[in-house]
């Protein structure tokens, strides 16, 4: 029996097609992705093919101004209309609460939300009963699929789920599901999660009973053969993994921003038993037509978003100073902005060690793109963040030992006066240049916020110590020279769209002056 | 092969119930979301109700809302219809059908002969 | 709840004609929308779902096309026993409904 698996993950508000790097749609010729273009493809393999599952892994919510606006609204009605058969819950789901979870996602979804180690208490427990399943056994033809869900237990650290929604291990409450499954005769189990492609390979080597894994977070590219774009693939797809019982898993991922869609077809045998597995992401190009109707449906949603981006967020008393000629130089308070914007979105609930899990921030003063002026009433609309932040990009959280931020902020400075854009922009963080000194010796000193501290000072990097920093995708990635960050990280987490951070700070602020302060000197 | 049978029809009085029966053979029936449709004599074809593959969700037009009930026996391959308060406008040839095995509205990929409900005093 | 509107009711055609109809619905249904073959005294038959899939076992020289509000269903070349009348569904939502029918008769 053959069972053809359609996955996306990692989509991220990417609903209208967008540009090869997933930034906005400039050439239209050029681009991809979207759900009109991810329409057409899975239409026609299923008229194709008889036995066909559409899954997602998570992390459909925050990206776009599409997400701002409609609140994940737009992902139910997109997500129905594509008529997907089920969705694991990833952590950007609870970006805005467990209201903004349950309300336009969980309510309004036709088909199954699945995750399997999260468990409510407390009176949410009622409110969210049914909304969201551990499992749901699926009839596909004449025979019946399993899909058990699974989410990121540092959900917690990553979003707002709030206090009352525990996170277990995935692989301590999976297994428990599965094994439900297979007393109700459900031979053939597909792990369906969001917690990044390690752990995907350890639900598929410690779960027993999963027969495939499909997985998202970690915006993993796998392929088997010549890569059709820009992204290198992290191994073969499917990637198999041998089970501590022996078996074959396949473990599939299909990069993020609905740039390409997951294609695996698997044979089982009568008993369920994986017999073969192949397949590649397919990359939604502009070969693909966009739906007509889908298409036109996005249009009708697209309007109420050009509206949204005129109006007033909030005010500034002060000029911001995006230039580049501040920015690439010297502390700028658009930096400054940004960044306590970074921090202010990772607030979480403190306890009686910790004032918050995270403090410090970097910047890379070549991504602020623009100054906004304050003699315009002081009003700051989206369409002006747009300008300084105009790439798309994401705010997310690592972890660094010492030793790599010193080198990242010897790097900063290696080149200093050639308005180069790797020169950093702090918060949580003093630190002191003497740039008489020769490249790679800069850096004289070198303070950063504590964390573990119920009134927060500032003491001296410690070089063995492990430090979570919110930077830009861009600098996670190893942009601007930042090879040491993409290399040493020990963890990456992707975060919330960076003009979104810095309206939702502003939108909470109301009237901002941010100020050069002595953060770098 | 792949058969629905209905069985069930008959001529009653308005006001009066009837119940109809589909017997299912040849695939999984309780994979499949099953509908009843109906077609007056001369007339086109008109859904009547659904009721998904696991009997979580039922759907009916306003035309039959109230009056009928869809129900299903998965353990005996088996859909009912159970119409109550019958009017002369009821009278029609009532079809069982296949839908999909997802909780998505469908189109019907196989038909039974149909059963004749004749109501008339 | 979605109209739909099939045209024409009716219509006279020769073995080996192209015959096409068409269906409309009152708001788009995406290619939501099936095609039925029903024969006098039998049960419709499935020919066309998703707007442009044939059903197993139908013949090529039907095919279906469209997308949103406008549907179309064309019969290459009649045969002798493509004479019936052709149902359109839409399944987009609750209610399913169908249009009106049309008759292809023998001219």
């Known amino acids: 029996w053959e069972l053809t698996i359609l996955h996306t993950n990692d989509v991220h508000s990417r609903l209208e097609q967008t540009s090869e790097d997933s930034s906005k749609c400039v050439n239209a010729s050029r681009c991809m992705g979207g759900v009109a273009r991810l329409f057409t493809k899975v239409q026609q393999i299923r008229r194709a093919e008889p036995n066909v599952l559409l899954l997602d892994a998570g992390d459909q919510y925050q990206g776009t101004i599409w997400f701002t606006v409609y609140k994940g609204a737009e992902v139910a009605h997109f997500m129905n209309a594509l008529r997907y058969d089920a969705m694991a819950l990833g952590n950007h789901e609870f970006d805005n609460g467990v209201e903004g979870l349950i309300e336009p996602l969980l309510k309004e979804a036709k088909f199954p939300i699945l995750s399997a180690n999260i468990k409510a208490k407390g009176p949410l427990a009622s409110q969210i009963s049914g909304l969201y399943l551990p499992y749901k056994v699926l009839p596909v033809g004449d025979e019946v699929v399993g899909i058990v869900g699974y989410t990121s237990k540092e959900t917690p650290f990553l979003s707002n789920p709030g206090t009352n929604l525990v996170f277990e291990d995935e692989i301590t409450a999976l297994q428990p599901e599965v094994d439900k499954l297979k007393t109700l005769n459900v031979n053939k189990i597909i792990a369906l999660g969001h917690s990044g492609f390690e752990m995907d390979k350890l639900i598929a080597q410690k779960v027993r009973g999963v027969d495939v894994v499909v997985g998202g977070h970690s915006n993993t590219f796998l392929y088997t053969g010549n890569p059709p774009s820009k992204e290198v693939p992290a191994g073969k797809y499917p990637f198999i993994v041998t089970s501590d019982d022996g078996r074959k898993v396949p473990v599939v991922q299909a990069y993020a921003f609905g740039k390409y869609l997951g294609y695996l077809k698997i044979e089982f045998d009568e008993r369920g038993n994986v017999i073969s597995s192949h397949g590649n992401p397919i990359l939604l190009n502009s070969s693909i037509p966009e739906d007509p109707s889908i298409k036109a449906d996005i249009n009708k949603w697209r309007i109420k978003l050009d509206n949204y981006s005129t109006q007033e967020l909030g005010k500034t008393i002060v000029y911001l100073d995006g230039s580049s000629q501040s920015c690439r130089f010297r502390e700028c308070n658009m930096g400054n902005l940004i960044c306590d914007a970074m921090i202010n979105n990772n607030l979480r609930h403190a306890d009686e060690t910790f004032w918050n899990h995270v403090s410090m921030c970097i910047l890379n003063g070549g991504g602020i793109r623009s100054p906004i002026d304050e003699r315009n009433n002081g009003t700051i609309t989206w369409e002006n963040l747009a300008a300084v932040l105009p790439f798309g990009g994401t705010f997310d959280l690592v972890q660094l030992k010492g030793s790599t931020l010193k080198k990242a902020f010897e790097h900063s400075v290696h080149r200093y006066g050639q308005s180069t854009g790797e020169f950093l922009q702090v918060g949580g963080i003093h630190v002191v240049y003497d740039l008489s000194r020769k490249p790679g010796d800069r850096v004289v000193k070198l303070d950063v916020l504590c964390t573990k501290c119920r009134v927060p000072s500032y003491d001296p990097l410690k070089m063995d110590e492990v430090y979570k920093v919110i930077l830009p995708n861009f600098l996670a990635n190893g942009g601007d020279g930042f090879q040491m960050i993409k290399d040493e990280l020990l963890r990456h987490d992707s975060g919330d769209q960076d003009i979104n951070v810095v309206s939702t700070y502003i939108s909470k602020m109301k009237v901002i002056y941010p100020a050069v302060e002595g953060r770098i000197k | 092969q792949v058969q629905l049978v209905e069985s069930g029809g008959g001529v009653v009085q308005p006001g009066r119930s009837l119940r109809l029966s589909c017997a299912a053979s040849?695939?999984?029936?309780?994979?499949?979301?099953m509908h009843w449709v109906r077609q007056a004599p001369g007339k086109g074809l008109e859904w009547v109700a659904v009721i998904w593959y696991d009997e979580s969700n039922k759907y009916y037009p306003d035309s039959v809302k109230g009056r009928f009930t869809i129900s299903r026996d998965n353990s005996k391959n088996t859909l009912y219809l159970q119409m109550n308060s019958l009017r002369a406008e009821d009278t029609a040839v009532y079809y069982c059908?296949?839908?999909?095995?997802?909780?998505?509205?469908?189109?019907?990929?196989?038909w039974g002969q149909g059963t004749m409900v004749t109501v008339s005093s | 709840d979605i109209q739909m509107t099939q045209s024409p009711s009716s219509l006279s055609a020769s073995v080996g004609d192209r015959v096409t109809i068409t269906c409309r619905a009152s708001q788009g249904i995406s290619s939501w929308l099936a095609w039925y073959q029903q024969k006098p005294e039998k049960a419709p038959k499935s020919l066309i779902y998703?707007?442009?899939s044939l059903q197993s076992g139908v013949p090529s020289r039907f095919s279906g096309s469209g997308s949103g509000t406008d549907f179309t269903l064309t019969i290459s070349s009649l045969q002798p026993e493509d004479f019936a009348t052709y149902y359109c569904?839409?399944?987009?939502?609750?209610?399913?409904?169908f249009g009106g029918g049309t008759k292809v008769e023998i001219k």
């Open positions: 569904q839409q399944y987009n939502s609750y209610p399913l409904t």
């Open positions: 998703a707007a442009s």
């Open positions: 040849g695939f999984t029936f309780s994979n499949y979301g």
């Open positions: 059908a296949r839908g999909g095995s997802s909780w998505y509205p469908d189109s019907f990929d196989i």
